[in-house]
């Protein structure tokens, strides 16, 4: 496939990545699927600088990111290592809270109103952010 050298329309370029910010809400799995269909992934936060950039664009609104522990360990959707990577949890989080009454604990991470992270029920309809890297081979066939 061809390499993507500029961001699609309505996406924001930052540090060799493209970001798309939703204005509606979806469950985490649906948001994840939306990004995949756009040849992207839910945002993976790898630095304080990227955290500030995303935070600036989403404002004080609960917003899904590409981090979950639905199969046990916390995992970033693009394979970035959680253990050694950037983290920005709110104090006392993640807490896998069961008191919401929706069944099970909390397995999906989101930006809270102050930008720091919380784990929550994956079915909640939050906004989301998609990310794709520039210079990544796209799925489209090259133009002949």
């Amino acid at each position: 496939g061809s390499e993507r050298t500029c961001c699609p329309v309505n996406w924001v370029e930052h540090e060799r990545s493209c970001y798309w910010f939703s204005r509606s809400g979806k469950a985490w799995a649906d948001a994840d699927n939306y990004c995949r269909l756009e040849d992207a992934h839910l945002v993976v936060v790898t630095s304080w600088e990227e955290q500030k950039f995303v935070q600036h664009h989403i404002g004080p609104v609960n917003t899904w990111m590409g981090l979950h522990d639905q199969n046990g360990p916390w995992k970033w959707v693009d394979g970035t290592d959680y253990e050694t990577g950037f983290k920005n949890w709110r104090p006392e989080q993640p807490d896998d809270w069961y008191g919401h009454g929706l069944g099970g604990g909390e397995d999906c991470a989101h930006f809270t109103d102050d930008g720091r992270w919380n784990d929550d029920v994956c079915q909640r309809p939050y906004r989301w952010v998609c990310e794709t890297e520039l210079d990544k081979a796209s799925q489209e066939p090259p133009l002949l």
Epitope: D69, P73, K87, E92, D96, Y98, G105
Partner: antibody
């Protein structure tokens, strides 16, 4: 390597106390709830207690409530189970587990007998 | 508290057989259920999470299905290393509860 290692089991008289420890390594301990599960000799598995990553939420099985206390020290990557007023029916192998039961320790045997 | 009723309590099967184990919850637990394999003297090992998702590293001959109150673990073609005891666990709400176990023995 992600690992849990229990210790502290042994023989104790009815009414006695014991403190089990579970040492975690290879993962960000504070990011995960942890649990204790036990298995009496020749019997099935029984959930005993859970504690959230920063100890905000703690839960106990009715069979141990008021006698057992779960705690953790994230600075030491350690989980604990303080067991008081032990009874014969508490005799079991005690396992610690984490990552929603993906990782388990090898178990430590607690025997309550006079 | 939610009761988990597992059946059968034991079964005899041969290598290559298709094996099915059932777990019934006393109330709706959505899909918040796991399946575990335990061999003598060893800690349990999670095979399935969220009723139907295969834990990474677990052979694809294991599968889970169900939602609400009825759940099934299927081993499509039993292998020698699969002879063990299997447990279901509901983690939908506290207290978490295990089924009583199903021992799979060699016929």
């Amino acid at each position: 390597e992600v690992q849990l290692v229990e210790s502290g089991g042994g023989l104790v008289k009815p009414g006695g106390s014991l403190r089990l420890s579970c040492a975690a390594s290879g993962f960000t301990f504070s990011s995960y709830s942890m649990i204790w599960v036990r298995q009496a000799p020749g019997k099935g598995l029984e959930w005993v207690s859970s504690i959230s990553g920063t100890s905000s939420y703690i839960y106990y099985a009715d069979s141990v409530k008021g006698r057992f206390t779960i705690s953790r020290d994230n600075a030491k990557n350690s989980l604990y189970l303080q067991m008081n007023s032990l009874r014969a029916e508490d005799t079991a192998v005690y396992y610690c587990a984490g990552m929603t039961t993906v990782i388990w320790g090898q178990g430590t045997l607690v025997t309550v007998s006079s | 508290d939610i009761q988990m009723t597992q059946s059968p309590s034991s079964l005899s099967a041969s290598v290559g057989d298709r094996v099915t184990i059932t777990c019934r919850a006393s109330q709706d637990i959505r899909n918040i259920l796991g399946w575990y394999q335990q061999k003598p003297g060893k800690a349990p090992k999670r095979l399935i999470y969220a009723a139907s998702n295969l834990q990474s590293g677990v052979p694809s001959r294991f599968s889970g299905s169900g939602s609400g109150t009825e759940f099934t673990l299927t081993i499509s073609s039993l292998q020698p290393e699969d002879f063990a005891t299997y447990y279901c666990l509901q983690y939908n709400s506290y207290p978490w509860t295990f089924g009583q176990g199903t021992k799979v023995e060699i016929k």
